[in-house]
């Protein structure tokens, strides 16, 4: 059986302030069961950006319908980007449990924010 892969295809994404940024992520298998979460930064100080299961993330939406059967696309769109959103974003797969256990992280996508064209 193939090892689970978390694919973040782009190394970097550049977006003008005020626009939306799409951060792509797909997983190679639906097994094991468990959620995907998005973080900015790595390590213990990382910031949770999106958790499909719970929480309120008003500027973040899933690109694909997360309720679709066999969905393996966990890309997100962040609206109204500001310079404060710059950083490296990681798509992380967890195994369902109490608590959920982190299994694998994507390679990361660096988001840079350009000044809004005048």
């Amino acid at each position: 059986e193939e090892e689970l892969q978390v694919i973040q295809p782009e190394k970097s994404v550049s977006v003008a302030a005020g626009d939306s940024a799409t951060l792509n992520c797909t997983v190679s298998s639906l097994i094991p069961v468990g959620p995907i979460q998005w973080f900015r930064g790595a390590g213990p100080g990382r910031e949770l950006i999106y958790n499909l299961k719970e929480g309120h993330f008003p500027r973040v939406t899933a690109v694909s319908d997360p309720t679709k059967r066999n969905n393996m696309d966990f890309s997100i769109r962040i609206s109204n980007i500001t310079p404060a959103d710059a950083g490296t974003y990681y798509c992380v797969k967890f195994r369902k449990g109490s608590p959920d256990v982190e299994l694998k992280s994507g390679a990361g996508t660096e988001l840079s924010v350009r000044a809004k064209p005048s």
Epitope: Q8, P9, E10, K11, S28
Partner: antibody, heavy 119, light 103 residues
Framework: DVQLVESGGGVVRPGESLRLSCEAS????????MTWVRQAPGEGLEWVST????????YYADSVKGRFTISRDNSKNSLYLQMNSLRADDTAIYYC????????????WGLGTLVTVSS | ALTQPASVSANLGGTVEITCSGG????YGWYQQKSPGSAPVTLI????NRPSNIPSRFSGSTSGSTTTLTITGVQAEDEAVYYC?????????FGAGTTLTVL
């Protein structure tokens, strides 16, 4: 066994249209993104267009945007490429490819169909 | 854009590495075309995955911005053009191709 069979190629004049088809078998067609890739004589591979599993999202290379339309019929396990306003530089072998979970990776290819645009 | 050498050569039974670098991709694939106009064959997708019909002498690895296709125990039938492919949509997806000559 995965099989992809293209058809619809031929010789046309500049400005004319052509519709390519790709019939898929050996996998659950509706679950996968599908792609057209072309190869001009003596040149390398060039990505042309990709369509999502449900058919609601399409991606195009700049060179064909506005002229080509990709579509699919999941009930017929078929992929299509409608090519309008054809130009001489569209002359190529057009391959149908099955995309893996991320659409810029391809795991299976068809044998291709030749499109020649010449006056 | 993805950059790969135009040509490489290898001795029959030897080992050859073909590299590809650049672009905005985190992941890569490799495709083989034995003659112009013949159907490409996927050797490697997403860095290391090999389709079930591909011999184990083909392997892929990625480090940073460089991906490498390694052919161990090169055979005469491996003479072909090898294209790398990137995961980023902005990369044009394919490199220009590397011709492998078997000596």
């Amino acid at each position: 066994d995965v099989q992809l069979v293209e058809s619809g190629g031929g010789v046309v004049r500049p400005g004319e249209s052509l519709r390519l088809s790709c019939e898929a078998s050996g996998f659950t067609f509706r679950n996968y993104y599908m792609t057209w890739v072309r190869q001009a004589p003596g040149e390398g591979l060039e990505w042309v267009s990709t369509i999502s599993d449900t058919g609601d999202t399409a991606y195009y290379a700049d060179s064909v945007k506005g002229r080509f339309t990709i579509s699919r019929d999941n009930s017929k396990n078929s992929l299509y490429l409608q090519m309008n306003s054809l130009r001489a530089d569209d002359t190529a072998i057009y391959y149908c490819a099955k995309s893996w979970i991320w659409w810029t990776f391809f795991d299976y290819w068809g044998l291709g169909t030749l499109v020649t645009v010449s006056s | 854009a993805l950059t790969q050498p135009a040509s490489v050569s290898a001795n029959l039974g030897g080992t050859v590495e073909i590299t590809c670098s650049g672009g905005n991709s985190n992941h890569y694939g490799w495709y083989q075309q034995k003659s112009p106009g013949s159907a490409p064959v996927t050797l490697i997708y997403a860095d290391t995955n090999r389709p079930s019909n591909i011999p184990s002498r083909f392997s892929g690895s990625t480090s940073g911005s460089t991906t490498t296709l390694t052919i161990t125990g090169v055979q005469a039938e491996d003479e072909a053009v090898y294209y790398c492919g990137g995961s980023s949509t902005g990369d044009g997806i394919f490199g220009a191709g590397t011709t492998l000559t078997v000596l």
